[in-house]
């Protein structure tokens, strides 16, 4: 259950939610390993080799979708698969990478002024002009496309990073996903371990900004592996 989240020292000692990032620019967000959040969904990164079983797209990361690994495979065995890039075949929007959508069975670019994301329902408490999703739990496989133009500002609820304005990414915070700032030089970031540990998290942090990567802080080299601090640094 999620109760362990409140018993975890890690949660009290996490850096501020806006203060961290992924160690690879290809991923929208970075997970704070070992932390559980309501919903129980897990987010995979390109550092992870272990396939993550899923029942629906929203259980996967922002750059993934949920499907059977083999064509015509057992429908009961589904895993998170890498999203499909532009001009690749698709059956639904969630299969296409952020910034694209599925049209006539092919992933095509989302013209910002024509198509933006998938929203199941217009939120009754709409956030100004942010027609944003709910709690990050919307079931993407059943969503209908809505047309809207405004990119989410900092603090807006979002589904994926393409819902957020420039300089922001879509990252989990507690029970929701909101637009948070991409990290600046010197800010704390999260470097994922390679061993496929598929950490549950309650906070996700954006990636490091352009020209920056998530690296171990020089004065922390002597520290134990578990307590090494990573920050966004110039390449």
């Amino acid at each position: 259950t999620l109760n362990s989240v409140l018993n975890s020292n890690a949660i009290k000692n996490l850096p501020p939610p806006l203060g961290g990032a992924a160690g690879h620019p290809g991923s929208a967000v970075s997970a704070a390993p070992g932390i559980l959040y309501p919903g129980g969904n897990k987010y995979q990164t390109i550092d992870n080799y272990q396939p993550y079983p899923c029942a629906e797209d929203e259980e996967c990361g922002t750059d993934e979708y949920c499907a059977s690994p083999t064509r015509g495979g057992d429908a009961g065995v589904q895993i998170c698969l890498a999203c499909r890039k532009r001009r690749k075949r698709c059956m639904r929007h969630a299969m296409c990478c952020p910034g694209n959508y599925c049209k006539n069975g092919i992933c095509v670019s989302s013209d910002q002024n024509h198509f933006r994301g998938e929203i199941e329902e217009t939120i009754t408490e709409s956030f100004g002009n942010d027609h944003s999703t709910l709690d990050g739990y919307s079931r993407r496989t059943t969503l209908s496309s809505k047309m809207y133009h405004t990119k989410g500002q900092e603090g807006s609820v979002c589904l994926r990073s393409s819902d957020c304005a420039s300089g922001l990414c879509c990252a989990r915070h507690f029970w929701s996903k909101i637009c948070k700032p991409v990290l600046k030089e010197g800010q704390v970031c999260t470097k994922h371990r390679r061993k496929g540990s598929h950490g549950l998290e309650i906070f996700q942090r954006c990636y490091c900004g352009e020209g920056l990567s998530c690296r171990i802080q020089k004065d922390h080299h002597q520290a134990s592996n578990s307590s090494r601090l990573h920050t966004c640094q110039r390449h």
């Epitope: 999620l2 949660i11 939610p17 408490e125 709910l134 603090g155 915070h173 507690f174 029970w175 929701s176």
Partner: antibody, heavy 117, light 107 residues
């Protein structure tokens, strides 16, 4: 529109349990997490816990040390909060609250639970 | 848990006055601060989320500012219907915690 309708007031004896319900309408129940917050008479607000109706996952405030259990019935779009081993200082109005982001956007009308011998 | 301290605990002002309530967090909470209004016998209502974003349907006379540990809630021109208790809430770290409230009365 979104509505959260809670069960009526309860009077309980110390040591007893209470189960408060919160019936949701006007939205897809499984799409939003549901929180429970209580307010003792003349006091402030205190978060008790959260449940994800889509899978029943829960997270609780440690202060309640296993005395509280949150559940949902998806078929009736109803969330429940059970508090056990009631004490006089559990006398409070108990609210369910639905989130859209990390904030509580919609609230039930509240249920007064009085614990008295 | 993060402690939230509101001040003043009560205040009296006249219609048309500018009213300011402050909220201090025991540690840095970035922008993860919400403000709620509660009228007697009613459930709280969300006014402001993420420090300064106005919830839908909330009049523009309400505003929020600050960052880190010190935050301010302002009513630019007090109206009779604004009589209520106002609470700040941090959602930076679990469990979410609230300030003790500020009771606003009309002079």
């Amino acid at each position: 529109q979104v509505q959260l309708v809670q069960s009526g007031a309860e009077v309980k004896k110390p040591g007893a349990s209470v189960k408060v319900s919160c019936k949701a309408s006007g939205y897809t129940f499984t799409e939003y997490t549901m929180h429970w917050v209580r307010q003792a008479p003349g006091q402030g607000l205190e978060w008790m816990g959260v449940i994800d109706p889509s899978n029943g996952d829960t997270s609780y405030n440690q202060k309640f040390k296993g005395r509280v259990t949150l559940t949902v019935d998806k078929s009736t779009s109803t969330a429940y909060m059970e508090l056990r081993s009631l004490r006089s200082d559990d006398t409070a109005v108990y609210y369910c609250a639905r989130t859209t982001g990390p904030w509580f956007a919609s609230w039930g009308q509240g249920t007064l639970v009085t614990v008295s011998s | 848990d993060i402690q939230m301290t509101q001040s003043p605990s009560s205040l009296s002002a006249s219609v048309g006055d500018r009213v300011t309530i402050t909220c201090r967090a025991s540690q840095d909470i970035s922008n993860y601060l919400n403000w709620y209004q509660q009228k007697p016998g009613k459930a709280p209502k969300l006014l402001i989320y993420y420090k300064s974003r106005l919830h839908s349907g909330v009049p523009s006379r309400f505003s929020g500012s600050g960052s880190g540990t010190d935050f301010t809630f302002t009513i630019s021109s007090l109206q009779p219907e604004d009589i209520a208790t106002y609470y700040c809430q941090q959602v930076h770290t679990l469990p979410p915690t609230f300030g003790q409230g500020t009771k606003l009365e009309i002079k």
